[in-house]
């Protein structure tokens, strides 16, 4: 079996529902899984009239459709919640919507951190 993966150990973490779910709102997540299984990062978001609302980011369990994806790219046309996954540490920092019908590619950059 050819194995072309970038090992995923850590992902960007975000939870828009952090208060209700009693979690942190954002940060880094260390990925843990069963031995010999691959791990991925993911991002999910909504797009309301061009306004991007992050839903969640974090680690994602072994999923064949995530294998060998270096970038987090969602391809569904107009879902309620956009989803992408990728392999490699913090690969979910940026995420992209590239609709299958050939619409414009839209990449979402994380906001720059404020200078300290």
């Amino acid at each position: 079996s050819g194995r072309g993966e970038a090992e995923t150990r850590e992902c960007i973490y975000y939870n828009a529902n952090w208060e209700l779910e009693r979690t942190n709102q954002s940060g880094l997540e260390r990925c843990e899984g069963e031995q010999d299984k691959r791990l991925h990062c993911y991002a999910s978001w909504r797009n309301s009239s061009g306004t991007i609302e992050l839903v969640k980011k974090g680690c994602w369990l072994d999923d064949f459709n995530c294998y060998d994806r270096q970038e987090c790219v969602a391809t569904e046309e107009n879902p309620q919640v956009y989803f992408c996954c990728c392999e490699g540490n913090f690969c979910n920092e940026r995420f992209t919507h590239l609709p299958e019908a050939g619409g414009p590619e839209v990449t979402y950059e994380p906001p720059p951190t404020a200078p300290t």
Epitope: G4, L61, D63, N65
Partner: antibody, heavy 118, light 111 residues
Framework: EVQLLESGGGLVQPGGSLRLSCAAS????????MSWVRQAPGKGLEWVSG????????FYTDSVKGRFTVSRDNSRNTLYLQMNSLRAEDTAVYYC???????????WGQGTLVTVSS | QTVVTQEPSFSVSPGGTVTLTCGFN?????????PSWYQQTPGQAPRTLIY???TRSSGVPDRFSGSILGNKAALTITGAQADDESDYYC??????????FGGGTKLTVLG
Amino acid sequence: EVQLLESGGGLVQPGGSLRLSCAASGFTFRNSAMSWVRQAPGKGLEWVSGISVTGGSTFYTDSVKGRFTVSRDNSRNTLYLQMNSLRAEDTAVYYCAKVYYYSFFDYWGQGTLVTVSS
Amino acid sequence: QTVVTQEPSFSVSPGGTVTLTCGFNSGSVSTSYWPSWYQQTPGQAPRTLIYNTNTRSSGVPDRFSGSILGNKAALTITGAQADDESDYYCVLWMGSGIWVFGGGTKLTVLG
């Protein structure tokens, strides 16, 4: 509309070779993992092989390892299964299937029949 | 060698409810195996019914539902209809690039 069209099946003698193709349309092929599943006459479905979006990772069921090779041409939107050293027990309808998140088969082709017989 | 087990055959009366199960020899089936279910009628390609344990594929009527029952994945058909007479297959994702199909259940709708 998603379409998967297999071709390349036929009658082949034991020890012979065949190459199956699966032409994909209606979705961004390069962004989808793919798989082959087969069904022997009167039997159940059996997973055969899978290939990642880039083709960088390939996997096989034990009974075909070293004999079958899965590949893809993302510029031609086509999935392939090269089958060598064919045996009578490889006789089956071979389906290609698109893999979606949560590692399930969301679309299937209509299948192509491979018959291995002398 | 992982073996996924399903009831070889099952019968249900029209309008009745039937639950098909999917287990395996290496322990309990959990949602991390992302069980999925497929329906196949003779001479046809499989049709996707359920994925991610309990999510219906698009166009699948809500008479079909998926769950975990005890240590197995389950497919429940409520209000069975004549055209539900088919073979039903479960698939478990073992991870690391490997899927295993169950042997299938032949469902007969009586009458």
